[in-house]
């Protein structure tokens, strides 16, 4: 059976604060727990939600959380349902409200010597206690001619006189907290001799050189005085007008008229009423000069047919606020329909191609009118003028693929090669009309090309296959100068490609035939054993039917490849002595020798006094220093061949001889002694 380990219990709660109704259940099977409020299931919200099997309140609400809560548990296996004891909240709260006139029924009926009752609309639970204030000063109960009824939250003034005038407010406090009136009541019981406002001047906005009128009236017994002042406190009368207000007239009823208003007349005007007694009443009104700024430019807009679009017209800054309307073809747009104006927006619903054109936003106020055009283009899906065609392009020449389309606005054309976007570079160029130019067609350009033409309304695409007509060419072109090693086997390759497989043959440049030890095997010239006579000029000829023939000239040199007669050896030298690194090479043509020391070529013309390279190739370094240590490379080269060999040079300090050592004792390591 279901057992409630913890049952929810009734409790005090504070409005807007946290609370928790606990419920813990034990049952044989899996249990569903849910909550009821006055018998109806409680739905989770961010404010009130199930927390495990308990019900959590993030902020108690006196209206939504009043009633009886019950925890319901249902054993999913046995089907049993059990309900907890009922629980409810005693919610403590206080809520601010205004001070209102209870008696008489309206402010107009308040007269000196009548009874006035004010009510404080602060409410709460438990019932709060109230305190009244006039102009911020507390009113104590039982003071002369006012009574406070805390039960009814009322303040009664009997009889009310001018001395009761002021701003009435109230505060209330309870166990929950305190609150003060959200809106206060100004009681004004006039002394007849005090000036009272009958008509207050209003701010006005006028266009330049127009007229402006301010009305102002006060009443009192005896009648009050009235005076107008401009910003700089200069009085305005019909007898003494300030220089910049020459066109001002004050009428008997207190109204002030300004004619032919100029910018210098703009500012604050004060109307001052003074009764026989009491303070002066100062009323202010501002004269603004109408103005309107220029409108920002519109960017041209491109829309697609069938869509709904809006163009917002930002009204220019202006005084008074400019009114805005849209026109098309000189006709003002309606406020409903398919193309209409909504607020400051131009709305085009279910756009048609015929909606394209110039729309004008107008703005106007007293200062004038401004307008700004927006050009609306209705995009169309591109259509074909000329699709790309399968093409045969010649290798090495420029090739063109057309993609000519038309649409509004002008379509954007992109090209793909093997599904990869072609970015313009030195080889590819896309013309304004969409045509693709391949600047110098290569064999591997033979593939699929696809062009896509797009506008905001949509896109079309087509593809074409390019076949490259290969030119007759050597692949690779033979080196024009080549060397063969004397008395050795040698081969000189020559291969070519073309639209048809070319025939390749070699001949001597003088037209003489090849000797019998030289064979031409499918383009490879083969020398079984190179002789001096094999040197000379040879021509490789590649030919096929459709493309004719091409020739490549090769000068063959017969050489004896370089060998070293003498190679430099690992050398150790005392500091200050002379080092000799020997190197001698032989070959035909006779090789030249260069030295490289410490990773840089030693230039014979810039060696300085300490170094010298002999005719036979040896390198001598006088007065060696530790920094001369390192690897030295002897490089032998001729027009056919290059070879190098290297050896290290070590520079060491000369040891100081010990007493016991005789003058003839040998050095500790193999040295060059000079």
């Amino acid at each position: 059976a279901i057992v409630f380990i913890k049952q929810p219990s009734s409790q005090d709660a504070l409005q807007g604060r946290r609370a928790l109704l606990r419920c813990e259940v034990e049952a044989p099977g899996p249990v569903h727990v849910y909550w009821l409020l006055d018998g109806a299931p409680v739905q989770d919200t961010e404010r009130r939600f199930a927390q495990g099997s308990s019900l959590s309140f993030a902020a108690v609400d006196r209206l939504q959380d009043s009633g009886t809560f019950q925890c319901v548990a249902r054993d999913d296996v046995t089907g049993e349902e059990a309900r907890s004891a009922n629980a409810s909240f005693n919610i403590k709260w206080i809520e601010a409200g205004p001070v209102v006139l209870k008696h008489p029924a309206s402010e107009a009926e308040i007269q000196p010597q009548t009874q006035v009752t004010l009510r404080c609309h602060i409410d709460g639970h438990p019932r709060p206690t109230y305190q009244w204030f006039r102009d911020g000063t507390p009113l104590s109960d039982g003071q002369s001619n006012h009574t406070v009824s805390s039960k009814e939250r009322n303040l009664t003034l009997r009889p009310a006189g001018p001395e009761h005038s002021g701003l009435y407010s109230c505060c209330a406090h309870s166990a929950f907290g305190q609150a003060c009136s959200s809106q206060n009541f100004t009681l004004s019981i006039a002394d007849e001799s005090f000036a009272r406002v009958v008509l207050a001047p209003q701010d006005v906005v006028v266009a330049r050189y127009e007229e402006a009128m301010f009305h102002c009236q006060f009443s009192a017994q005896p009648p009050p005085s009235l005076q107008w002042l401009f910003e700089d406190e200069t009085p305005i009368t019909n007898r003494s007008r300030p220089p910049h207000l020459r066109r001002a007239t004050v009428f008997a009823n207190g109204s002030l008229l300004l004619t032919q208003v100029r910018p210098r007349n703009a500012g604050i005007y004060r109307c001052i009423g003074q009764g026989q007694r009491g303070p002066p009443i100062i009323l202010e009104a501002t004269l603004h000069l109408a103005e309107i700024e220029d409108m920002p430019l519109f960017e041209p807009r491109v829309f697609t047919a069938g869509s709904e679009e809006r163009v917002t017209c930002l009204p220019p800054k202006g005084l008074p606020e400019p009114s805005v309307w849209w026109e098309h073809a000189g006709v003002r747009l309606p406020t409903h329909g398919r193309v209409y104006q909504k607020g400051h927006e131009l709305v085009l619903a279910n756009i048609a191609e015929s909606d394209a054109g110039v729309y004008t936003c107008h703005a106007a106020n007293l200062a004038g009118q401004r307008r700004q055009d927006v050009n609306i283009t209705v995009a169309t899906v591109p259509s074909w003028l000329k699709k790309p065609q399968d093409s045969q392009l010649e290798e090495g020449k420029p090739g063109y693929l057309d993609c000519l389309t038309q649409a509004t606005p002008k379509p954007t054309v992109v090209w793909y090669r093997n599904q990869m976007l072609i970015s313009e570079d030195s080889r590819f160029e896309v013309f304004k009309n969409g045509t693709l130019r391949i600047n110098s067609v290569e064999v591997y350009d033979g593939t699929w090309y696809r062009c896509m033409s797009s506008t905001p309304a949509g896109s079309i695409e087509a593809q074409a296959r390019v076949q490259v007509l290969e030119k007759l060419k050597f692949t690779p072109p033979p080196q024009p100068q080549q060397c063969m090693e004397f008395d050795k086997e040698a081969t000189v390759p020559c291969s070519a490609t073309g639209r048809e497989k070319p025939t390749i043959k070699w001949e001597r440049a003088d037209g003489s035939s090849l000797p019998e030890w030289v064979t031409d095997n499918a383009g490879t010239l083969h020398f079984a054993r190179v002789t001096r006579d094999d040197a000379g000029n040879y021509t490789c000829i590649a030919s096929n039917g459709p493309q004719g023939q091409i020739r490549a000239h090769v000068q063959l040199t017969v050489a004896v490849f370089i060998t070293f007669k003498v190679e430099p050896e690992r050398t150790t030298v005392y500091q200050g002595h002379t080092a000799l690194l020997q190197c001698e090479a032989q070959g035909d043509p006779k090789p030249l020798i260069q030295w490289k020391g410490k990773d840089r070529i030693l230039d014979p013309t810039k060696l300085g006094p300490r170094m010298h390279i002999f005719q036979n190739g040896s390198l001598v370094i006088h007065d060696v220093a530790p920094e001369d240590s390192g690897r030295y490379t002897c490089i032998a080269g001729n027009s056919c061949n290059i070879k190098h060999t290297e050896a290290p040079l070590y520079v060491v300090d000369k040891p100081v001889p010990e007493e016991s050592e005789g003058p003839g004792s040998p050095p500790p390591y193999k040295m060059i002694q000079t």
Partner: antibody, heavy 113, light 111 residues
Framework: QVQLQQSGAELMKPGASVKISCKAT????????IEWVKQRPGHGLEWIGE????????NYNEKFKGKATFTADTSSNTAYMQLSSLTSEDSAVYYC??????WGQGTTLTVSS | DIVLTQSPASLAVSLGQRATISCRAS??????????MHWFQQKPGQPPKLLIY???NLGSGVPARFSGSGSGTDFSLNIHPLEEADTAMYFC?????????FGGGTKLEIK
Amino acid sequence: QVQLQQSGAELMKPGASVKISCKATGYTFSNYWIEWVKQRPGHGLEWIGEILPGRGSTNYNEKFKGKATFTADTSSNTAYMQLSSLTSEDSAVYYCARGKQYWGQGTTLTVSS
Amino acid sequence: DIVLTQSPASLAVSLGQRATISCRASESVDNYGISFMHWFQQKPGQPPKLLIYAASNLGSGVPARFSGSGSGTDFSLNIHPLEEADTAMYFCQQSKEVPRTFGGGTKLEIK
């Protein structure tokens, strides 16, 4: 021990209504939900809804609203399911169950003209 | 509604071997840390019998050869070692929310 005894097989004409009963013994009838399940050959099991007899609270599968109506008589410890506007689609075996644990033997309903 | 997909629709397993049936829910059937997923066995002409409740708890009088596992959306029923009497239809059911829904069923046969 807990037992649920269902009424016998029914043969009904299309358009008619039928009331199937499920008598419970061996426990406090009011405090336990009775669920109703439909089984058609090749259609598996379908949950129709449930009733808590003591309170008359019900939950229906939206699919069976207007088709099935649950009632319970606590004096006789019997739950009822009425099926209205019968069609051949209503031909099936109907089970009552207390929770997941205890099931009635099933009532076969055949709707045929 | 929560949809329960059972797999396989049918399977044949040798005596003494292990049979595994899966049930996948279209959304989680977990609440307050409990998985509201149950397994039933039904033999021809009989009402369904509760085997496993709350994903892994053995029903009353059900042999320990039956076990259940899983949480959230993926659940399985295991029978090991298989006996002749286990030939039946097996159904999964969720009771997290109304309407309670059943899986399409798995027919288990002994090879």
